[in-house]
């Protein structure tokens, strides 16, 4: 899952300070104990750039190698740069490691535009900023790539969050997490807190900028506002969700349900934009025209191409519409929808035009794949992967960019009958419906 | 086939304002199609953007001008304007006005342009 | 601040000959860029937009190429219409408000 228009992004004005915080209602489920509280080492242990991914840091190796790691909640390999590369100013040396085994197989990852490939092994890895555990896990040493790592991103490797089921070579390769959680009592659960910058950052601000937080085994209450509402995970191989329906300011698309999620729709950290199937994504792009029709702009915006631009502090969100998804609830006929806002799907951009100016791309965009949850709905929620009870949950997140008037929001529950047809049923044929590329 | 003239004073006394009006003849100015532009060039150098309206009413200015312009509509007139405070006589140039076309990309269409000179 | 650089800053060609004009953006701007045409005394006139396509009435002896940082305007076989200044501009941060400094092409 990645490149492009697949990795984290930033949008639109700071967000609250924490004496504006909305009190945060009772959670009405029970928790299982430990799932809950505070992780306060955890907290703030991402970084990012705009578009260009969040990233955690890692240690590998004995004695330890520390490398910053790309969070991907949309692939399951955990793959290190392991060779000198021209954007790398870092990379795991395996020989330098006396926790090193070989597993004598190679692995080879194919992207729409890009690819790397490596050799297996497994190590010895452990989360500065996480919890206080090493674990032995299985890791792919990157020794040639193309269109991979990102000049100027400070990440030198890639954390595939996923199921097993997408791993390549092969279902046999264990993820990270699944090796974590069986060597540790560290619960099956991870929560992330995506952070827009909200404002175009320069060179020296992004370095210096906070991202969020990869919460590992629970959820943090300071991270978000209001309830958790959860989606059933539809199935373990990426995070796939069912989206029921889908609103621009409150007017319905009023497409067959199915479409939405043709061929899956997936939550992924690793895409930078709010990515939908193409009648989707056309019927999307007609209405937010038709609600912000007192400005006109390029077709080249739309695409996702050509920058935008207002003299600084102008920039006219109240144009733009909010985008509602529905996604099934955990009760039956019961959904629920999040909302974002325009600070969330337009992607502030830096070093375009002058200082006195703030330029944003569009980030929504069209997909062959399905939909995909990118950080630009990421970015307006605390996201819970709660993989031991199979669901995902968003709450409004605390970091959440946003102005006066509006506010990202996650609301429910709404009743909708027949949600189970809106998912797609994927013909099985051989290996060849398993896309990695995703650009 | 539709037609842009610029008109108003060709000269200005420094630290006034700079007046100017387009007239759209042969088309209409509430065509959703375009946005109308204008854009100066001083004697002898090269060309500088100051800023389109749609007919909405809807604006973008050049920072570099620093809020001394405002550009508005008359779609009753199928005319726009320029307003420039506070000039001096590096705003001297020749001013033209401009449909913003092609998708609302690009200047395909020009006025003559005027000469507005600023001195006392 | 995308920056557009023009090169040469004059070119001198007799009639029939080619000219090759070259504008060079400091980042790149994708396919988004325009090359107008300007004469003395009078307003410019839109050549090619979006890199490579003319604009209508635009004679087929000019033609523009390039993408991202690198465009060219070629003028297969200049006739004495064609001495004028010539400028590019780039609309990929919109709205377009980045002109280059020009090339004059003159007589020889």
């Known amino acids: 899952t990645h490149l492009g228009i697949r990795l984290p992004l930033r949008s639109g004005l700071a967000g609250p300070p924490l004496g504006l915080r909305l009190p945060r209602e009772t959670d009405e489920e029970s928790e299982e104990p430990g799932r809950r509280g505070s992780f306060v080492e955890m907290v703030d242990n991402l970084r990012g750039k705009s578009g260009q991914g969040y990233y955690v840091e890692m240690t590998v190796g004995s004695p330890p190698q520390t490398l910053n790691i790309l969070v991907d909640t949309g692939s399951s390999n955990f793959a290190v740069g392991a060779a000198p590369h021209p954007f790398l100013h870092r990379y795991y040396q395996r020989q330098l490691s006396s926790t090193y085994r070989d597993l004598r197989k190679g692995v080879y990852v194919p992207y729409t535009q890009g690819k790397w490939e490596g050799e297996l092994g497994t190590d010895l890895v452990s989360i500065p900023h996480g919890p206080n555990v090493t674990v032995r896990a299985n890791i792919a040493a990157i020794t040639e790539s193309d269109k991979f790592f990102i000049n100027g991103s400070n990440w030198e490797g890639i954390l595939g969050l996923a199921y097993a089921e997408i791993a390549r070579p092969d279902d046999s390769l264990e993820p990270f997490f699944d090796s974590l959680v069986k060597q540790t009592h560290i619960p099956n659960i991870f929560s992330l807190q995506l952070c827009g910058a909200g404002f175009p950052l320069n060179q020296t601000e992004a370095l210096a900028s906070v991202g969020g937080s990869m919460i590992i085994g629970g959820i943090d209450h300071s991270l978000y506002t209001g309830r958790l509402w959860y989606t059933p995970i539809r199935r373990e191989w990426y995070y796939e969700v069912i989206i029921v329906r889908v609103e621009i300011n409150g007017q319905d698309l009023k497409m067959d349900c199915k479409e939405y999620n043709y061929d899956k729709s997936i939550v992924d950290s690793g895409t930078t934009n709010l990515r939908l199937p193409k009648k989707v994504f056309e019927a999307a792009v007609k209405s937010i025209k038709a609600a912000s029709s007192t400005e006109k702009f390029p077709d080249g915006f739309w695409l996702g191409e050509q920058l935008v631009c207002w003299q600084a502090g102008t920039t006219p969100w109240n144009i733009f519409p909010v985008i509602s998804l529905y996604l099934m609830g955990e009760v039956t006929n019961q959904s629920f929808r999040i909302t974002i806002l325009p600070q969330q799907y337009l992607r502030p951009v830096e070093d375009v035009a002058t200082s006195q100016d703030d330029c944003y791309k569009f980030a929504v965009s069209q997909s062959s794949t399905g939909t995909v949850m990118g950080a630009v709905i990421m970015e307006g929620f605390y996201v819970v992967f709660d993989r031991a009870r199979k669901r995902i949950g968003f709450a409004v997140s605390a970091c959440h960019v946003h102005d006066e008037f509006r506010t990202a929001a996650v609301e429910g529950p709404f009743v909708t009958a027949d949600m189970e047809d809106c998912g797609y049923n994927i013909p099985q044929t051989d290996e060849s419906t398993l896309m990695t590329g995703r650009a | 086939q539709l037609q842009l003239q610029e008109s108003g004073p060709g000269l200005v006394k420094p630290s006034e304002t700079l007046s100017l009006t387009c007239t759209v003849s042969?088309?209409?100015?509430?065509?959703?199609?375009?946005?109308w532009g204008w854009i100066r060039q001083p004697p002898g150098k090269g060309l500088e953007w100051i800023g389109n309206?749609?007919?909405?009413?809807?604006?973008y200015y050049n920072p570099s001008l620093k809020g001394r312009v405002t550009i508005s509509v008359d779609t009753s007139k199928n005319q726009f304007s320029l307003k420039l405070s506070s000039v001096t006589a590096a705003d001297t140039a020749v001013y033209y006005c401009?449909?913003?076309?092609?998708?609302?990309?690009?200047?395909?269409?020009w006025g003559r342009g005027t000469l507005v000179t600023v001195s006392s | 601040e995308i920056v557009l650089t023009q090169s040469p800053a004059t070119l001198s060609l007799s009639p029939g000959e080619r000219a090759t004009l070259s504008c060079r953006a400091s980042?790149?701007?994708?396919?988004?860029l325009a090359w107008f045409q300007q004469k003395p005394g009078q307003a410019p006139r839109l050549l090619i937009y979006?890199?490579?396509n003319r604009a209508t009435g635009i004679p087929a002896r000019f033609s523009g190429s390039g993408s991202g940082t690198d465009f060219t305007l070629t003028i297969s076989s200049l006739e004495p219409e064609d001495f004028a200044v010539y400028y590019c501009?780039?609309?990929?941060?919109?709205?377009?408000?980045?002109f280059g400094g020009g090339t004059k092409v003159e007589i020889k």
């Open positions: 401009a449909r913003l076309g092609h998708g609302y990309n690009y200047f395909d269409l």
């Open positions: 042969g088309g209409s100015i509430s065509s959703s199609s375009y946005y």
């Open positions: 309206i749609y007919y909405s009413g809807s604006t």
């Open positions: 980042q790149s701007v994708s396919s988004y």
């Open positions: 979006d890199a490579s």
């Open positions: 501009q780039q609309v990929y941060v919109w709205p377009p408000r980045t």
